[in-house]
């Protein structure tokens, strides 16, 4: 039987119930908040061999091994995963080893032991068997193993019973429990799986198979499962669902998304059944199951039941997240607000249409509408007063409506209106005019010429860069001494610059009036000598990094025929010069014969420019004697030898470590001081354990219902 | 409060034709999939018809498909179903539900775990 769709155990153990006859859990499988301590040796559930998800233990009082409640659980596909995790055991205060004697594969996603004051056998298994990846798995904070002796089957009567692995350079024997060890298949089989008696399963199966080279016989398997059979795709007029079985067209055409209150219903697309078209997707008409590409981003229509939709706040604009198309009317109405712009344009940037008119009023925190990154047309089917379909009144800071070069902007019906905005320049509106259409439109009194733009420099000269010098974390520029009609005019100049990996920046993006800026400012005094041209230093700077700069002259508001003169330059695109890479991460050594060994890392997070070889080197180190001291056999001697697993327990460390010399003598020695890379290293291992729980607690606490 | 009231229900003979209404209030309908359900007497309750908010999509039960038509009208609130060649068979109780979300996963369009609401029903009669 297919159980789900997720399966959540909570507050009363006896729920456990709703698992009796599950074979596969579609979904995922939580148990959680059992305060009170249970015995579970009546439940087991012997039919449970997979779970399509994950499998969340979160403080479950009482139980102390999973092995008697899931004997046959044997795959956890992790399609969908808890915070990266398919397998989460989290302050389970009881549980002394997880005991999940039969599970084999995890086939996506990492797991998360930590928390477990009482759990064993931790060290004893060998992850890689069952996952592809073992270095994000996270197991911190149990019992330590030197509290543990761990001892696998028939180890104390010197007949162990269980296959040895190598982990971290130890070659141990691997075990769940003191009686169940872990199985391993024969190397013939290669990645296939085995049956009980060691006999390859048929390269479809997934962990094991009660009969070898059956593709019927598969516990799980590997791709698909349809009609009882493990196959590598789904059949003709089969669709994929949920990751792991095939559906025919009917079943996807009656099923509705329990998490939505609409009534959608699922799609095929790509031969897969899916509750949504994927991204850059729409559905092919209203009562279709199939997907077409959208035409640039796909449409959502978004429509104000008042008609005019008031954008007073960040609130206000996260309404229309997504809408491509509004219905209706838009008036902005910003007086404040903190990072306003890139908030408005996280919100309203993928507007493309309104269909009535846009209004902009008393806006003094907008310094431009570029905000509005993809409006394309103002059809003005709706008009204020006047016929105005684009009003823009008393706005003390705006100085940019949109980089006309840049910009396809229609205003289909209607005129505008601009009037009191101080900062923007009478030539932006004309040459908005020109790009709209809407030039004749307008009569003599709808763009004040007067007081627009009497408080901006609307005459503005170019500055022209000289040189550009560039280190690895440093550029240095020059730029033509700018000489306004009167000298005294100029004050100093101010430089601009930001990173920019794509050469499509603007001066106002990210910018308003509030204070908020995407762009670092330095201020540059004159050189006190008139034939030396100014410059910079820009210093502190990412290696191998495209920077966009500009320079802006401060002049006074020197009036020249009714106009400010001042002058900027064009944006320059500049990168740094690359630099030697950070070191490479998550390095790791395995052997996999007597003369081989294996070596895997991922690039390292800061390249520093284009990464083209890696340096691997490697010298023989002498045999640890430490090895041979031991009896390994008895149980009270077994040596405390210390891992490093990435994270240091402070109660763990119980003496001083001895080192060969110290200070001219040997004897004990302090731990050397940390390094700033480990106390780094340490808080963020501390910040993400801090993510992780608020996460869980997020996930997991939820009001009861209704 | 969300409030369904059926309408429309009666005697009719077979091959005749009915038009049943539910008039929603108490949350904003034009966001909300719809259904009918029926319940015969004896027997469980089933699913007739869905339709979703935002596309229209409609969903039918085979017993009744190419019969029936279920409709919405947004601006006022009310669900429709155009029952047509109806046969003895269609006699039940009729109601109408509204959906809701139920956590995680999937279910069938006519499981009645997915819908949180529903109306006190309209008897319809098919009889000669």
């Known amino acids: 039987e297919i159980c789900g769709p997720g399966i959540d155990i909570r507050n009363d153990y006896q729920q456990l119930k709703r698992l009796e006859n599950c074979t596969v859990i579609e979904g995922y499988l939580h148990i959680l908040l059992i305060s009170k301590a249970e015995d579970y040796r009546s439940y087991r559930f012997p039919k449970l061999t997979v779970i399509t998800e994950y499998l969340l233990l979160f403080r479950v009082a009482g139980l102390e091994s999973l092995g008697d409640l899931f004997p046959n659980l044997t795959v956890i596909r992790g399609w969908k995963l808890f915070y990266n995790y398919a397998l989460v055991i989290f302050e389970m205060t009881n549980l002394k080893d997880i005991g999940l004697y039969n599970l084999r594969n995890i086939t996506r996603g990492a797991i998360r032991i930590e928390k477990n004051a009482d759990l064993c056998y931790l060290s004893t298994v060998d992850w890689s068997l069952i996952l592809d990846a073992v270095s994000n798995n996270y197991i911190v904070g149990n019992k330590p193993p030197k509290e543990c002796g761990d001892l696998c089957p028939g180890t104390m009567e010197e007949k162990p019973m269980c296959e040895k692995t190598t982990i971290n350079n130890e070659y141990n024997y691997r075990c769940w429990t003191t009686n169940r060890c872990q199985k391993m298949c024969p190397s013939t089989c290669g990645k296939r799986a085995c049956t009980e008696n060691n006999e390859c399963c048929h390269p479809e199966c997934l962990g094991s198979c009660s009969a070898p080279d059956n593709d019927t016989a598969c516990v799980a398997c590997r791709h698909y499962y349809y009609a009882g059979v493990c196959v590598p795709a789904c059949p003709p007029n089969t669709y994929r669902f949920e990751g792991w079985r095939c559906v025919d067209r009917d079943f996807c055409a009656n099923i509705l998304s329990a998490e939505s209150s609409d009534s959608e219903g699922f799609v095929i697309h790509d031969g897969e059944c899916m509750q949504e078209c994927p991204s850059g997707f729409i559905r092919n008409g209203s009562q279709s199951m199939y997907c077409i590409p959208c035409e640039g981003p796909c449409p959502k229509v978004c429509e104000e039941e008042k008609k005019t939709k008031t954008i007073d706040s960040v609130t206000s604009a996260q309404m229309l997240q997504g809408c491509t198309i509004f219905k209706g009317n838009l008036l902005i109405n910003i007086r404040r607000g903190n990072n306003i712009a890139s908030e408005l344009e996280n919100f309203m940037g993928l507007i493309e249409v309104v269909t009535g008119y846009v209004k902009i009023r008393h806006s003094h925190a907008l310094v431009s509408l570029s905000f509005l990154k993809n409006l394309r047309l103002i059809l003005g089917e709706e008009q204020l007063e006047g016929n105005y379909s684009f009003y823009v009144l008393d706005n003390q800071n705006l100085q940019q409506l949109w980089d006309w070069d840049h910009r396809n902007l229609t205003i289909k019906a209607g005129k505008m209106y601009f009037a009191f905005n101080p900062k923007l320049c009478v030539s932006e509106i004309y040459r908005m005019e020109e790009v709209t259409g809407t030039k004749g439109r307008q009569s003599k009194g709808d763009i004040n010429t007067r007081n627009n733009g009497e408080r901006a420099s609307c005459e503005s000269d170019v500055l022209h860069f000289t040189s550009t010098t560039t280190s690895k974390n440093r550029i240095i520029i020059t730029w033509h001494r700018y000489r306004p009609p009167d000298y005294r005019d100029l004050i100093s100049f101010t430089v601009y610059y930001k990173e920019a990996p794509f050469k499509n920046v603007t001066e106002y993006d990210g910018q308003d009036a509030c204070g908020s800026n995407s762009w670092n400012m330095v201020d540059v005094d004159l050189p006190p000598n008139k034939d030396v041209e100014p410059g910079i230093l820009l210093h502190g700077l990412k290696p191998w990094t495209q920077y966009a700069v500009y320079v802006k002259a401060v002049t006074l508001t020197m009036v020249e025929n009714d106009h400010i003169r001042g002058a900027k330059s064009e944006i320059l695109y500049i990168r740094t010069n690359a630099s030697v890479p950070s070191i490479p991460l998550d390095v790791l050594s395995a052997s996999n014969s007597s003369s081989q060994l294996i070596v895997k890392w991922n690039p390292p997070s800061l390249p520093n420019g284009n990464l083209s070889y890696y340096i691997v080197r490697w010298q023989r180190q002498p045999q640890d004697g430490y090895l041979y001291r031991h009896n390994y056999c008895s149980k009270d001697k077994i040596p405390i030898r210390k891992y490093a697993d990435g994270t240091i327990d402070i109660e763990e460390v119980t003496e001083n470590p001895k080192t060969e010399v110290c200070g001219g003598e040997k004897g004990p020695c302090c731990a050397c001081p940390k390094t700033e890379a480990e106390k780094q290293a340490e808080k963020e291992e501390a910040e993400y354990r801090k993510v992780f729980e608020n996460f869980l607690h997020n996930s997991i606490f939820v009001p009861r219902p209704e | 409060e969300v409030q369904l009231v059926e309408s429309g229900g009666g005697l009719v003979q077979p091959g005749g034709s009915l038009r049943l209404s539910c008039a929603a209030s108490?949350?904003?309908?034009?966001?909300?999939?719809m259904a009918w359900f029926r319940q015969a007497p004896g027997k469980e309750r089933e699913g007739v018809s869905a339709?979703?908010?935002?596309?229209?999509?409609?969903y039918y039960a085979d017993s009744v498909k190419g019969r029936f038509t279920i409709s919405r009208d947004n601006s006022k609130n009310t669900l429709y179903l155009q029952m047509n060649s109806l046969r003895a068979e269609d006699t039940a109780v009729y109601y109408c539900?509204?959906?809701?979300?139920?956590?995680?996963?999937?279910?069938?369009?006519?499981?009645?775990?997915?819908?949180?609401?529903w109306g006190q029903g309209t008897l319809v009669t098919v009889s000669s």
């Open positions: 108490g949350f904003t309908f034009g966001t909300f999939g």
């Open positions: 339709i979703s908010a935002s596309s229209g999509r409609t």
């Open positions: 539900a509204v959906r809701s979300k139920q956590g995680a996963g999937y279910g069938f369009w006519y499981e009645g775990r997915l819908y949180g609401y």
